[in-house]
Structures are given as structure tokens and as C-alpha cells.
């Protein structure tokens, strides 16, 4: 699997999409996990509804939400109020019993807020109490890492 990079701005929401073959993964729940180290395990962050039929319902764990379009074959993860510590490697997974198939490997990059330390004026920033549905979702920038490419090249 190549790694797809998704970039989001600190404090805003980032939407990660993982396309998959809906027939191949029919009836299977999905999950979003965080890779702990290069060879380490992938720690489950959130998974879709226990009843596959209800996978379209948004489930959340803290600032992360997941929803699955099982007909269209797209798993969507929303990271709300993105913080620097959210940066790192993740996976979208398809679950079959105790097994987990990787649908997509993801690198989340958090960019500094360009409006930071400036007068935000009338800019609306979603409050902590507001729901995912109301949160403003930034269109994420994504690209695939080339084979052998270093995700964070050293700066000269």
C-alpha cells in the first residue's frame, strides 16, 4: 500500500476519505487506527457501528468521527480541532473477525494556522461544544507518497 498524505490546518477539521471495493468488503465493519511506530501495532481509534447495516451512522471517539458509505464504498474519517499531536501515520481498515485488512495507509500532516496571531475579524471558529455536523470541514489536501520518499524531508 502506498501512503496517502492528508494535510489540515491546526484548529480546523480534516476529512480523510478511504475508497474501497464495496462488494469485496460487503458486510464488514471498518476502523480507523493509529500506527505506533514503523513496525508497531495499529491502535484502534474508532470503528463503525456494531451493526453493519447502520454503518452510515456517525460514530465518534473524542475529536475523531467515522462514517461508512457501504454502497458507494467510501469510509470517511473526520478529525476535528486538529492539533499537532494528531500528526502521524494511520490506517483505514476493513474488519473480518479478528483480522483487519488495510484499505489505505494515511499520513496526517498538521499545518500551522496562517491566521494565528492575527486579527481573525469575523472569522467563525467552531466552539468546542458544537457538533461534528455543524463543524466547518476544510477540504483536505492529499497526495500519495512516492516509493522511498521520506514523509518529512530534512530541511537545509
Amino acid at each position: 500500500h502506498n501512503t496517502t498524505v492528508f494535510q489540515g490546518v491546526e484548529g480546523q477539521s480534516l476529512q480523510v476519505s478511504c475508497p474501497y471495493d464495496s462488494m469485496k468488503h460487503w458486510g464488514r465493519r471498518k476502523a480507523w487506527c493509529r500506527q505506533l511506530g514503523e513496525k508497531g501495532p495499529c491502535q484502534r481509534v474508532v470503528s463503525t457501528h456494531n451493526l453493519w447495516l447502520l454503518s452510515f451512522l456517525r460514530r465518534r471517539n473524542g475529536s475523531t468521527a467515522i462514517t461508512d458509505d457501504t454502497l458507494g464504498g467510501t469510509l470517511t474519517i473526520t478529525l476535528r480541532n486538529l492539533q499537532p499531536h494528531d500528526a502521524g501515520f494511520y490506517q483505514c481498515q476493513s474488519l473480518h473477525g479478528s483480522e483487519a485488512d488495510t484499505l489505505r495507509k494515511v499520513l496526517v500532516e498538521v499545518l500551522a494556522d496562517p491566521l494565528d496571531h492575527r486579527d481573525a475579524g469575523d472569522l467563525w471558529v467552531p466552539g468546542e461544544s458544537e457538533s461534528f455536523e455543524d463543524a466547518h470541514v476544510e477540504h483536505s489536501i492529499s497526495r500519495s507518497l512516492l516509493e522511498g520518499e521520506i514523509p518529512f524531508p530534512p530541511t537545509s
Partner: antibody, heavy 122, light 107 residues
Amino acid sequence: EVQLVQSGAEVKKPGESLKISCKGSGYSFPSYWIAWVRQMPGKGLEWMGIIYPGDSDTRYSPSFQGQVTISADKSISTAFLKWSSLKASDTAMYFCARQGIEVTGTGGLDVWGQGTTVTVSS
Amino acid sequence: DIQMTQSPSSLSASVGDRVTITCRASQGIRNDLGWYQQKPGNAPKRLIYAASSLPSGVPSRFSGSGSGPEFTLTISSLQPEDFATYYCLQHNSYPWTFGQGTKVEIT
């Protein structure tokens, strides 16, 4: 009509190779997993493995891993089960079956081939 | 691997009898279980999927129940064509596994 039609009976000698087939019709063959099931004479059913013809993703039962090869050619809507060196203990009936798709999720094995008898004897 | 323990291995019954066959999984399989009927010389036929759902064309005298570790196939009134061998199959985890089978014979 959704159908899986298997190749005919085979009589082989130990050490010989063999490839049997299972041709799907009446549905989108690449979009459904195909399983292989063994039934030795007078015995029960044993799940050997499964393949998704769309991308040839394959899973094997540990009991059959390394003993057989499961493959598929979606261009001719056919799945295959292959032995490189047959043993007398491979004598059995072999079934292919399609994993069903139901509104509520997967539906087990909903359509079965008629079976292929393989006899291995010196 | 998940073991499926099916009981009884055989039973004798008469036409009109109520017959119950049980399958027990060695670990949780949700409702990812099907029941299959096989007659001598024929391919198996699916009778029940998702533990309790009846495919179209299967007579309503067949029913499935249970979840978690224990599942049951019931034939409410045995008919002459029901004398066969019955298998359960779990498709929750690889490798999928069948029960040992239950042969239903005429008394």
C-alpha cells in the same frame, strides 16, 4: 440464472499435477468471493480457502496452505483449484461456492457448483 | 481457528417430528452462521443465513435461532425429503469452519 459449473471428474496418479475449474454465470463474477470446499469419501465438509476474483485476493485454511493454489481469471469468469503434486489423500469431491450478498450483510455460501470428483490412485 | 461443535452427530426421527440440531462456536461469531442441507451425491444447499434468515425458496418449516456461541436449526415438521445431512458454517473469521454434520435418518 446464477450458476457455478465445475469441470468433470478426474482420475490421476500420485505425483501428478491437476487444475480443476469453476465457471460462474448469470452474475458479475469479479464481485463475489468464491470458496472451495473439500469432502472426502463418507466425511464432512472442509473449507479450503476463498478468492475475490476482482483482485485475486486469496485466503487459505492453514490445513490447505501450501498444499493447493486457488486462482481466478475474471476475464473468463472462472476460478481454479490446483495441485502441483497429488497424493492419494487428495481423493475427494471438491465444491466451489459463492459467498452471498444480502441486504443485512454477507449470506454465507449461497450458490454451489455440482462438485468435481478427484480420484488419486496408483 | 474457531471450532464449531455440532450435535447430535446423527438422529432418527419420523415424518411430522420436530427436529433440533445445535452448533456451538468456540468463540463469538456474532450472527455470521449458516445452515446447509446435503443429500447423498449432491452439492450442499443453503437453508439459513445470518443465523436466522430464510432464503427465498426454502420451506418455512426450517428456522434458525441463536447468537453468540450457540445456534439452533429447527425443522418444525419433518418431511420425507428432509432426510439428509445438515451442516453449520461460521463465516465470521478466517479460516471459515463447518460443524461435523448431523445425519437425520428415518426411524
